[in-house]
Amino acid sequence: ARGPRCSQPGETCLNGGKCEAANGTEACVCGGAFVGPRCQDPNPCLSTPCKNAGTCHVVDRRGVADYACSCALGFSGPLCLTPLDNACLTNPCRNGGTCDLLTLTEYKCRCPPGWSGKSCQQADPCASNPCANGGQCLPFEASYICHCPPSFHGPTCRQDVNECGQKPGLCRHGGTCHNEVGSYRCVCRATHTGPNCERPYVPCSPSPCQNGGTCRPTGDVTHECACLPGFTGQNCEENIDDCPGNNCKNGGACVDGVNTYNCRCPPEWTGQYCTEDVDECQLMPNACQNGGTCHNTHGGYNCVCVNGWTGEDCSENIDDCASAACFHGATCHDRVASFYCECPHGRTGLLCHLNDACISNPCNEGSNCDTNPVNGKAICTCPSGYTGPACSQDVDECSLGANPCEHAGKCINTLGSFECQCLQGYTGPRCEIDVNECVSNPCQNDATCLDQIGEFQCICMPGYEGVHCEVNTDECASSPCLHNGRCLDKINEFQCECPTGFTGHLCQYDVDECASTPCKNGAKCLDGPNTYTCVCTEGYTGTHCEVDIDECDPDPCHYGSCKDGVATFTCLCRPGYTGHHCETNINECSSQPCRHGGTCQDRDNAYLCFCLKGTTGPNCEINLDDCASSPCDSGTCLDKIDGYECACEPGYTGSMCNINIDECAGNPCHNGGTCEDGINGFTCRCPEGYHDPTCLSEVNECNSNPCVHGACRDSLNGYKCDCDPGWSGTNCDINNNECESNPCVNGGTCKDMTSGYVCTCREGFSGPNCQ
C-alpha cells in the first residue's frame, strides 16, 4: 500500500508513517517500529540492544538507520556490556547481598533477609520475622522487641485484641460488632454505613458500581448501576463474553475483550476476522531455499524447486541414488542433481556394469593395465622400451614419431627404456598420471573432491562454501529474520530469535497483543505490529487506559482542594468559601456579629470587628469598665459605653456626686428657727415653743403613747419610738424572733419569748446559751 505523499510528489511515508507539516516543511512522522526520512527502516532500538539499563538512540550511518547506546553508570562498550572499573567489582556485599553502584567508587548493598550493615556483614535478629501480624521488629541488644499494631499484643504480636469488648462500643447507630483476628467488623443497619456505621447510608456514595458503571439511587438505601457497554451484573462486575456468534474465520480463535473481541489468527491468515490471506512469498523472501520459486496460495504458499532439490521449502537435496542404476555391489554416492557409482573390485564403467578385463592380467609383466570405461576391455600401457598389445615388444620410445611421454612430457631415451620429464600436475613414468590433488583430503565438512589437472575442486555439502568448503555459509547474510529478529547462523540453516511481539520461523507473525486484554476500564484494544493501542472510554487515559484522567489538573477549585472522580471532580472548599469551584467567599459579617456599634470587616473564613471606643473583645462584646477608678465620691457608679454615670446618694449632686446639697438654701426653718445643713437634710434649731422639724408645730406627738413596747421621743412635727429589746417596728409593735440567730450552742433548743429567748440544753450542758 502507498503511504501519503510527502514533500516531493511521488515520495511516500512507508510502514504506516504519517505525513505532517512542521515549521513550514512536510516530514514523515513514523510509528515506533520504523525510522528514517520515509519511515523506511525498521527501528534498530526495538530489539533493546543496549544492556545493563543503557539507553538506545537511533543514529544515521551513511543513510542507514543504526543505533548507539548511552550506557548507565559503570558500563561501557557498544552494547553497554563491559563494566567499567567500579566499586561493585570488588565484591563488597557479603552473604548474598546485591551491589548497587552510586558512583564509580561508591556503592550500596541490598542485603538478603537476615543480614544488615554496609557490607551485609551483620546478622539481623529480626531476620526470622518474629513479630507476627504486621508487628514492627526492632533489634534490641542481642534480641529484638516487637511493636505491635493496635489489633494485636503479646511479645510477638500473636494475641488478638477483642475490639468488640471496648466501652463504648465501636459500632455506632445500633450496628453489631463481630470480633475478627486482628480487627473487627461492624454489621450496620440498613440506614448507616462506614467501618463503624458512623455515616448515614447514602446510596451511590461511594459508588459500588465497578468498571466505570454509573450509580443511581433508587430509594433511601437502594441503588442501581448503569453499566458501560460490555459489562453486566448488579454492580457491573461481570465482563460480558462477546465471543458467542463471533466472525473469526479460517481457524481463528476468539479472545474476549471489553465490549469487543479479537481474533487470534493461524499463521496463514490475518486481518480483523482472519479473512485476509498472508502473502508468505512477500513476507518471507527466503521461503523457498536453494533457488526455488515461491508461489503464494490462498491460505499458504508452495515452492517450485530447481533441479536436484525438493521439500516444502526446497531445502532437501534429492537423493539421486534412490533411482540410480549402480550395478550390484557398487556403492552409490549422492551429489547435487547427480550420483556417482563406486565400483567393487573387478567391475568398471559409470554404473559399474562392465567386467574389468584387467583382472586376468593380460598385459606383460611391468606393463600397466587400464580398463576401457565404455566396453570394459583391457588397455595395456607398456613400460618404457616395450610395445605391442601386451607390451611384449621392446621399443626405442623416443625415436618413434609419437612422444611416449603423455601430456607434453619431454622424452629422454635410455637403454631399453626412457624417462619422461612431466609438466606440473602430472606424474608417472610417462606423465600419464594426473596428480590426484584429492589424496590429501583437502575438502572439509563431508564435501566431494573432484581431481583436476594440476588442481582439485570441492563440491560442498549444503551449508558450506569456500575453496575447501571450510566456510559455514552465512544463511543470515540475506537478513531473513523480519521485524528486527536476531539471526543465528547454523549449518545449512538459520534460526531467528524474535523481538518481543513477533513469532514464527522468520519472526513474520505479529503476536496479537490484544489477546491478554491489556486495555482497562472498558477501553477498545487495537492490535498492531509488536504493539497495541488502547482507545479509552471517557474519563480515562494512559497506555492501558488505567489512569483516571485527573480532572483536577489544572486545578479548577479556586479556594479549596480538588477530589478527582471518573470524568468529574468535586471541590472540597477551604473554610470560608463555597460554590462549585469554591469561588464564593462566605460573608461572615452577614450575621452582624460585632456588638455595641462595632464595624464588621469580612475576611477568609473569618471577620474582624473594629470596636467603638470603650469596647473590646472579638465581637466588641466587652464594655470596658469606666467605673474601675471609682469616680463617684458619694454615689453609685453606672458603667456606660465609653463613659459612666454617677447615681448620687441622697444629699449629693454633681457629675461625681462630690457636691453636698445645701438643704438650708431654701430657709426651711420657720418662726425664727436656725437652719443647720446636714447630709441629705437639715436641722432647725427652733425657738422655745416650737418643736417640729421646721419649727412649725407646737404639738407633742408622744402624748398619744404611740410606742406600744418602747419609749416615745417627740420630734419636729412627729415622733420616734426607741423599742424595748425583742421588739421593732415604727411603733415597736413587731415581736422579734431572737432564735433566728441560733444562739443556743451544743445542740440546745431555742424558744422565742416575748422579750428574748430561752435555751433548753442537752444533758451535760448549761448556761443561758448552753455554752
Epitope: D85, N86, T90
Partner: antibody, heavy 116, light 115 residues
Framework: QVQLVQSGAEVKKPGTTVKISCKVS????????IHWVRQAPGKGLEWMGF????????RFAEKFQGRLTMTADTSRDTASMELSSLRSEDTAVYYC?????????WGRGTMVTVSS | QAVLTQPSSLSASPGASASLTCTLR?????????IYWFQQKPGSPPRYLLR?????????DSGVPSRFSGSKDASANAGILLISGVQSEDEADYHC?????????FGGGTKVTVL
C-alpha cells in the same frame, strides 16, 4: 601522566611501626581508591587493603585487621599506610596502587626491612 | 587449600602460544568470577594486563599487545591467560587475582621462560 611516588626504604626493629607515604599526580585523587600490596623477597603478591580518598573509608585483608592504618590527605593528594607491631615476616616491598577493582597503576615500591 | 593456584613455571618457544592457568578453589564460582592478570619483570612493579569475565565483559589495558587475551576453562574451574606468538620480551612472572568475599586475592604467580 599518572604517577605514584612512594617514600624511601625503611629499616625497622620488631614491635615498632612503619609509615609509608604515596604522593599521586596526573589524575583526580578522589576518583580512585589507593590499594596497598606487599611482596616478600622471592614470593608472590599479597593484598593488604585500600582507602577511598573521598570519605576515608577503608577495607582490610582480615590478616592485617588491627595493626594496619590507611589514610588519604586530599589537600596534599597523598595516601599513607602505617603497619604496627612489626615482625620479621613483614620484611617486603610495599606498593601503593591506583585503581578501583583493577589495580591499574603501581608505585615503584618501598622496601621495608624488619630486623633486630 | 589456596583460593587461587598457579603453576610455578612454564616454558614456551618464540612464536608459539603459551597458556597460563589460574585454578579457583572448588567452592568459588568461576562463572561469576572476574579474573585480573598482571605481568612483573625482575626489579619492577607489576603491570596490569587485562581482566576477563566473559567474551562480552573483558578488558585489555591500554598499551597491552593484542597477543595477550583472557578466557576460562569451566571443566578445570580455571581462568586462562593466552599469549599467542610468544616473544622474548614476554619472559616475566605472571600473577592472577580475583575479588573474593570483599577482598583481593592473588595467585602464587607463574614464571614464564622463553626458550
Amino acid at each position: 601522566q599518572v604517577q605514584l611516588v612512594q617514600s624511601g626504604a625503611e629499616v625497622k626493629k620488631p614491635g615498632t611501626t612503619v609509615k609509608i607515604s604515596c604522593k599521586v599526580s596526573g589524575y583526580k585523587f578522589t576518583d580512585y581508591y589507593i590499594h596497598w600490596v606487599r611482596q616478600a623477597p622471592g614470593k608472590g603478591l599479597e593484598w593488604m587493603g585500600f582507602v577511598d580518598p573521598t570519605d576515608d573509608e577503608t577495607r582490610f585483608a582480615e590478616k592485617f585487621q588491627g595493626r594496619l592504618t590507611m589514610t588519604a590527605d586530599t589537600s596534599r593528594d597523598t595516601a599513607s599506610m602505617e603497619l604496627s607491631s612489626l615482625r620479621s615476616e613483614d620484611t617486603a616491598v610495599y606498593y601503593c596502587i591506583r585503581g578501583i577493582a583493577a589495580l591499574a597503576d603501581w608505585g615503584r615500591g618501598t622496601m621495608v626491612t624488619v630486623s633486630s | 587449600q589456596a583460593v587461587l593456584t598457579q603453576p610455578s613455571s612454564l616454558s614456551a618457544s618464540p612464536g608459539a602460544s603459551a597458556s597460563l592457568t589460574c585454578t579457583l578453589r572448588s567452592d568459588i564460582n568461576l562463572e561469576t568470577s572476574r579474573i585480573y592478570w598482571f605481568q612483573q619483570k625482575p626489579g619492577s612493579p607489576p603491570r596490569y594486563l587485562l581482566r576477563y569475565q566473559s567474551d562480552s565483559d573483558n578488558n585489555l589495558d591500554s598499551g597491552v599487545p593484542s597477543r595477550f587475551s583472557g578466557s576460562k576453562d569451566a571443566s578445570a574451574n580455571a581462568g586462562i591467560l593466552l599469549i599467542s606468538g610468544v616473544q622474548s620480551e614476554d619472559e616475566a612472572d605472571y600473577h592472577c587475582m580475583i575479588w573474593h568475599s570483599g577482598g583481593s586475592v592473588f595467585g602464587g604467580g607463574t614464571k614464564v621462560t622463553v626458550l
